[in-house]
Amino acid sequence: RRDVAHGILNEAYRKVLDQLSAGKHLQSLVARGVGGSLGGGAGDDAEPLSKRHSDGIFTDSYSRYRKQMAVKKYLAAVLGKRYKQRVKNKGRR
């Protein structure tokens, strides 16, 4: 049981570290003037993570990750035609 508990904790800890490293990567992109500038929503700003309150770091990192995933799917669909974003018209092109 203890091993299982440790496994769960380690997994959770790894996810947190992954999220933090993703945040740092995104922060470096922002510093270069690329990442964070592309996004949806009026309340979505492009401030580097370091300027924000640490409480919001996970939410912010996750929202940027979601944004990246959305853009990747879009690019794959419109420039690569590999991902079919079809809800009602599946297979229709």
Epitope: G40, A70, K72, L75, A77, V78, L79, K81, R82, V87
Partner: antibody, heavy 112, light 109 residues
Framework: EVQLVESGGGLVQPGGSLRLSCAAS????????MTWVRQAPGKGLEWIGF???????YYATWAKGRFTISRDNSKNTVYLQMNSLRAEDTAVYFC??????WGQGTLVTVSS | DIVLTQSPSTLSASVGDRVTITCKSS???????LAWFQQKPGKAPKQLIY???TLASGVPSRFSGSGSGTEFTLTISSLQPDDFATYYC??????????FGGGTKVEIK
């Protein structure tokens, strides 16, 4: 016939607003990515942004804050709201489905 | 800023010529998601190639695309009268969405 038709373009004063529409016929737009692209007179193509099937919009750096993309699936129409317009926004604005079906474009002229 | 540079900007050629247009990106194109478009005056762009090398539906086989990473090429094996137009490359970037090249005008020599 499957086609996209943009409308809403015209002459607007600097600082003004305009809402462009992109209506589809012969196809249900609701499950497609819709993209807006513009082209200044005699210039190249410039990507503005896109909206996904869920209604989330994403923008080019320069467009964010002034331009808003939305969709009304019941009307089979996508919109581009443009605020605080400048002379350099003068262009033909195109909407495109998946970048493989394009409208004919609508001209927006920003001038006093 | 990401820059897609097309060369040449203008190309004078004759019917039957083999034509090559190059598109160079300042950053690696995500997934090699690069497309080529043809545009004629007063008309909307038409997609010719997607995924760097896949021919779009209905596009003649004389058009072909190649390349990866930061360098891509559009080739027209034997130029036809209908091919005189302006060609644009468009690359995909996770950080910036889509960027278009400056265009290459193919005109009659």
């Amino acid at each position: 016939e499957v086609q996209l038709v943009e409308s809403g373009g015209g002459l607007v004063q600097p600082g003004g607003s305009l809402r462009l529409s992109c209506a589809a016929s012969g196809i249900d737009l609701s499950s497609y990515y819709m993209t807006w692209v513009r082209q200044a007179p005699g210039k190249g193509l410039e990507w503005i942004g896109f909206i996904d099937a869920g209604g989330s919009a994403y923008y080019a750096t320069w467009a964010k804050g002034r331009f808003t993309i939305s969709r009304d699936n019941s009307k089979n129409t996508v919109y581009l709201q443009m605020n605080s317009l400048r002379a350099e926004d003068t262009a033909v604005y195109f909407c495109a489905r998946d970048l493989d079906l394009w409208g004919q474009g609508t001209l927006v002229t920003v001038s006093s | 800023d990401i820059v897609l540079t097309q060369s040449p900007s203008t190309l004078s050629a004759s019917v039957g010529d083999r034509v090559t247009i190059t598109c160079k990106s300042s950053e690696s194109v995500y997934g090699d998601y690069l497309a080529w478009f043809q545009q004629k005056p007063g008309k909307a762009p038409k997609q010719l190639i997607y995924d760097a090398s896949t021919l779009a539906s209905g596009v003649p086989s004389r058009f072909s695309g190649s390349g990866s990473g930061t360098e891509f090429t559009l080739t027209i094996s034997s130029l036809q009268p209908d091919d005189f137009a302006t060609y644009y490359c468009a690359g995909g970037y996770v950080s910036a969405g889509v960027a278009f090249g400056g265009g290459t005008k193919v005109e009659i020599k």
